[in-house]
């Protein structure tokens, strides 16, 4: 496969509701009509797939119904949002981009975005 540069932010802090968003940008060397984006999580030297979506250029990303990810695309940029995050989900989230169609096949893997998730403190009981 041919290499492709993928850029993503180094660090993102998830919101108090456990939502983190970041942009994944790829330098497309060809005129791809179909692109596959995969988010991988690396923690303790283990890599797991968080979510993946294939989209046609100019169309929206379609993740599986039960996916924790949503996203939109604009040109060579993909805006990714991961929901339902908890403190234990803190880790390095890597954006992998594949130009699937037409040939040639290009593969790009970003350096990863460190997502920090802090569980909100439980509200103390209030006496009125």
């Amino acid at each position: 496969c041919k290499a492709m540069h993928v850029a993503q932010p180094a660090v993102v802090l998830a919101s108090s509701r456990g939502i983190a968003s970041f942009v994944c940008e790829y330098a497309s060397p060809g005129k791809a009509t179909e692109v596959r984006v995969t988010v991988l999580r690396q923690a303790d030297s283990q890599v797991t797939e968080v979510c993946a979506a294939t989209y046609m250029m100019g169309n929206e990303l379609t993740f599986l119904d039960d996916s924790i990810c949503t996203g939109t695309s604009s040109g060579n940029q993909v805006n990714l949002t991961i929901q339902g995050l908890r403190a234990m989900d803190t880790g390095l989230y890597i954006c992998k981009v594949e130009l699937m169609y037409p040939p040639p096949y290009y593969l790009g893997i970003g350096n990863g975005t460190q997502i920090y998730v802090i569980d909100p403190e439980p509200c103390p009981d209030s006496d009125f």
Epitope: C1, K2, E34, T54, M100, P102, P103, P104, Y105
Partner: antibody
Framework: QVQLVQSGGGLVQPGGSLRLSCAAS????????MSWVRQAPGKGLEWVSS????????DYADSVKGRFPISRDNSKNTLYLEMNSLRAEDTAVYYC???????????WGQGTTVTVSS | DIQMTQSPSSVSASIGDRVTITCRAS??????LAWYQQKPGKAPKLLIY???NLRSGVPSRFSGGGSGTYFTLTISSLQPEDFATYYC?????????FGQGTRLEIK
């Protein structure tokens, strides 16, 4: 396990039509490019057509362009090749294949024979 | 269209021999090359993808090399089950094209 099961071949007269089907199982069908490849008796392999995972993009060999539309139904995990205006030179074993890394073809159907003869 | 030319078109060899098949592309295809093995009456089987990557489950006696326009498939020590026809295929651009095949026969 991962497999492709083909159906729909047979004997047809010149000018006739056939529809080949390729049922996929064991993998996420919609994530893969799919292709048709044929092999005439005693000859080598010839690429016929490919379709993107969503079905939104298709490409064809010049020899079949306009005659053999490729399609897929991702809800049924099935690939199709509609063969129209068949000619004697279309006689071959037709294989469906899954697109693998770097546009290789990593999983192949068992093949189905199409014979065009009067 | 990119033409793929294999050589030799046929080769006779003995069990244990080292055999190399070559494939030339009419233009630069980087490493977008695959090799297949086909036995009579059977579907082709992927051996090598990306010019040099061995497909999982394929014996390590098979290896691929090359880049650009010149590629090789080497079988380090022929086994009885290796006698078959071998094809190269470029995946750099449409139309996808195959070499004409190399028939490997028992000497």
């Amino acid at each position: 396990q991962v497999q492709l099961v083909q159906s729909g071949g047979g004997l047809v007269q010149p000018g006739g039509s056939l529809r080949l089907s390729c049922a996929a199982s064991g993998f996420t069908f919609s994530s893969y490019v799919m292709s048709w490849v044929r092999q005439a008796p005693g000859k080598g392999l010839e690429w016929v057509s490919s379709i993107s995972g969503s079905g939104g993009s298709t490409d064809y060999a010049d020899s079949v362009k306009g005659r053999f539309p490729i399609s897929r139904d991702n809800s049924k995990n099935t690939l199709y090749l509609e063969m129209n205006s068949l000619r004697a030179e279309d006689t071959a074993v037709y294989y469906c294949a899954r697109g693998g890394s770097a546009w290789s073809l990593d999983i192949w159907g068992q093949g189905t024979t199409v014979t065009v003869s009067s | 269209d990119i033409q793929m030319t294999q050589s030799p078109s046929s080769v006779s060899a003995s069990i244990g021999d080292r055999v190399t098949i070559t494939c030339r592309a009419s233009q630069d295809i980087s490493n977008s090359l695959a090799w297949y093995q086909q036995k009579p009456g059977k579907a082709p089987k992927l051996l090598i993808y990306g010019a040099s990557n061995l497909r999982s489950g394929v014996p390590s006696r098979f290896s691929g090399g090359g880049s650009g326009t010149y590629f090789t498939l080497t079988i380090s020590s022929l086994q009885p089950e290796d006698f078959a026809t071998y094809y190269c295929q470029q995946g750099n651009s449409f139309p996808i094209t195959f070499g004409q095949g190399t028939r490997l026969e028992i000497k």
